[in-house]
Interface confidence: low
Amino acid sequence: FERTRSLQDPCSNCPAGTFCDNNRNQICSPCPPNSFSSAGGQRTCDICRQCKGVFRTRKECSSTSNAECDCTPGFHCLGAGCSMCEQDCKQGQELTKKGCKDCCFGTFNDQKRGICRPWTNCSLDGKSVLVNGTKERDVVCGPSPADLSPGASSVTPPAPAREPGHSPQ
C-alpha cells in the first residue's frame, strides 16, 4: 500500500520539516522560516506560534515542531497548550475582573489560583472547630468536646496542601 501511495502521490515522500511544493513540480521544499510541518506529506507548512506579551517561549519553533509557550512569572497557564495566561494571586485571594481581591470572611483559598471556597462546616459532620479558618486556610475540624474522653483525644489533621499546578481546573 505504501509503495502504491508513493507511486500515486509523490508528496507522500516529503518528510516532516518540508512541504510538497506544487509550484515547483511537487518537489519537497524546506519549510520557510517561522513555519513547521510536524508530519510527512504536507502540502503546506504551519505558521509557528509566537510567544509574546505575557507569554514566554518554553520551546523554540523548529522546522518539525511548533513553539511552546508558558507564562511570565506571576502568571499561570490555562487551556490546552497554554492558550491563556491568568494572573497569580496570593493565598487568601481570588482573581476578579479588577485584579486580586481578598477572600470574604468565611471563605479561603490556599493556592495562587482559583476561587475562594467556603470554610468547612464542621457541625455537618457532628464535629467542632478545633482551629479557626483564615483567608488562607480552611478550618480544622475535630471531635466535639463531649466525644473526647481523657486520654483518647484524636483530632483530624489538616489535609496536606496541594502542590501548585496540580489543582483541578
Partner: nanobody
Framework: QVQLVESGGGLVKPGGSLRLSCAAS????????MSWFRQAPGKGLEWVSH????????DYADSVKGRFTISRDNAKNSLYLQMNSLRAEDTAVYYC???????????????WGQGTLVTVSS
C-alpha cells in the same frame, strides 16, 4: 492570524497626555471585549480598563479612574486609551488584550500585543 499591535507610547512629563492605539486584525474585532493592561518595571501585570464589544460597558481600575479613557472604533478595528494627567507611577509597558471568546466576562485573555512603553518623567 490574530494580531494586536500597540502604538503611541513615549516619554512624557508628569501632567502630560498620551493616546495609545491598538490595531487589531485576524478576528472579528467588533465581537469581543478588549482590555488594556500595564506592567511597570519589576512589577506584575495590572488590569487598567476594559470595554465591551459595542462600547456600552466600560470599566477602569481605581488607579486610573477619571484620568484615562478607553474607546474603540469597530469600523477601524482599533482600540484606544487616552491618558491624561499622567504620573510617574503610570510608567509601564501597556498591552492591549483580546478576551477569550469561550470565557466571556472572565479574566482570561487569549491574545496579547507586544506592548508599548510609556515613560512619565520630568
Amino acid at each position: 492570524q490574530v494580531q494586536l499591535v500597540e502604538s503611541g507610547g513615549g516619554l512624557v512629563k508628569p501632567g502630560g497626555s498620551l493616546r495609545l492605539s491598538c490595531a487589531a486584525s485576524g478576528f472579528p474585532f467588533s465581537d469581543y471585549f478588549m482590555s488594556w493592561f500595564r506592567q511597570a518595571p519589576g512589577k506584575g501585570l495590572e488590569w487598567v480598563s476594559h470595554i465591551s464589544s459595542s462600547g456600552n460597558s466600560i470599566d477602569y481600575a481605581d488607579s486610573v479612574k477619571g484620568r484615562f479613557t478607553i474607546s474603540r472604533d469597530n469600523a477601524k478595528n482599533s482600540l484606544y486609551l487616552q491618558m491624561n494627567s499622567l504620573r510617574a507611577e503610570d510608567t509601564a509597558v501597556y498591552y492591549c488584550a483580546k478576551e477569550d471568546p469561550r470565557l466571556p466576562g472572565t479574566t482570561d485573555f487569549d491574545y496579547w500585543g507586544q506592548g508599548t512603553l510609556v515613560t512619565v518623567s520630568s
